[in-house]
Interface confidence: low
């Protein structure tokens, strides 16, 4: 299987009843506190506002949250934990008319409500410490 | 595979504390997360909090400010410590283990069979 540069970053358009699907691994142990980061950017730029920024602390926390302006808004933690240490996983993000509904393994696990048009959104980026085997968006 | 075993519980005085114990046994007990749940009569298993193998702690809200979960894997056990007990709080509580940080009851690998906690005013 082969895998896809990380960062990786593409165009995309979206609308309400795409999903973003991502497959991959963590690179190292948790115990060593890799990340994973998934960015919505409101332009091919990675300075821009980011409409969803999602972030795995793996075996601690989940973090979410929107730039606006160059400023970072209310973020939302949960500390659900679906990730298993070592184990490959599915991400899928769903746009919802409402929120994006973020799904770990087929369950849903995570919500955050729209603060920047969807419409608005150009591309994402997928980071950190992470092997990338898949990336793709249905629309 | 883990098995476990609650105790601790018992009949006690509304403002009092407890503390439960999570007795484990199986050579890898200190990879899997820990968690304490309950059951009131007539009411839906609910989580109460959990220690993942690493030891970071979390409580759920009915019981935060109330609530110190531990682990000692040099024992293979799990405690809960619950200050300031209200009759509310009365329930069966059930210890399990995950291989995942998820405060779900369908997400749990392995179950207790519950200690019985009677709060009363």
């Known amino acids: 299987m082969s895998l896809l540069s990380v960062p990786h970053t593409e165009s995309v358009s979206l609308s309400t009843g795409s999903t973003v699907t991502i497959e991959a691994r963590p690179l190292v142990c948790f115990f060593n506190e890799p990340h994973l980061q998934v960015d919505f950017h409101t332009e091919m730029k990675e300075d821009s506002d980011i409409a969803f920024h999602f972030q795995v602390y793996f075996g601690n926390r989940v973090v979410m949250n929107s730039r606006e302006y160059r400023t970072w808004k209310e973020e939302v933690e949960s500390k659900n934990m679906p990730f298993q240490d070592g184990q490959e996983f599915e991400l899928r993000i769903l746009v919802l008319e409402d929120k994006y509904q973020v799904m770990v393994n087929g369950q849903a696990y995570y919500n955050f409500n729209h603060r920047i048009p969807v419409s608005s959104v150009k591309m994402v980026q997928v980071w950190r410490d992470i092997s990338l085997t898949k990336f793709n968006v249905s629309n | 595979q883990v098995q476990v075993q609650e105790s601790g519980g018992g009949l006690v005085q509304a403002g009092n504390s407890l503390r439960l114990s999570c007795a484990a046994s199986g050579r890898t007990f200190s990879s899997y997360h820990m968690m304490w749940f309950r059951q009131a009569p007539g009411k839906e298993r609910e989580f109460v909090a959990a220690i993942a193998w690493r030891g970071g702690t979390y409580c759920a809200n009915s019981v935060k400010g109330r609530c110190t979960i531990s682990r000692d894997n040099a024992k293979d056990t799990v405690y809960l410590q619950m200050n300031s007990l209200k009759p509310e709080d009365t329930a069966v509580y059930f210890c399990?283990?995950?291989?995942?940080?998820?405060?779900?009851?369908?997400?749990?690998?392995?179950w207790g069979k519950g200690t019985l906690v009677t709060v009363s005013s």
């Open positions: 399990a283990a995950s291989l995942r940080y998820v405060f779900d009851p369908s997400a749990m690998d392995y």
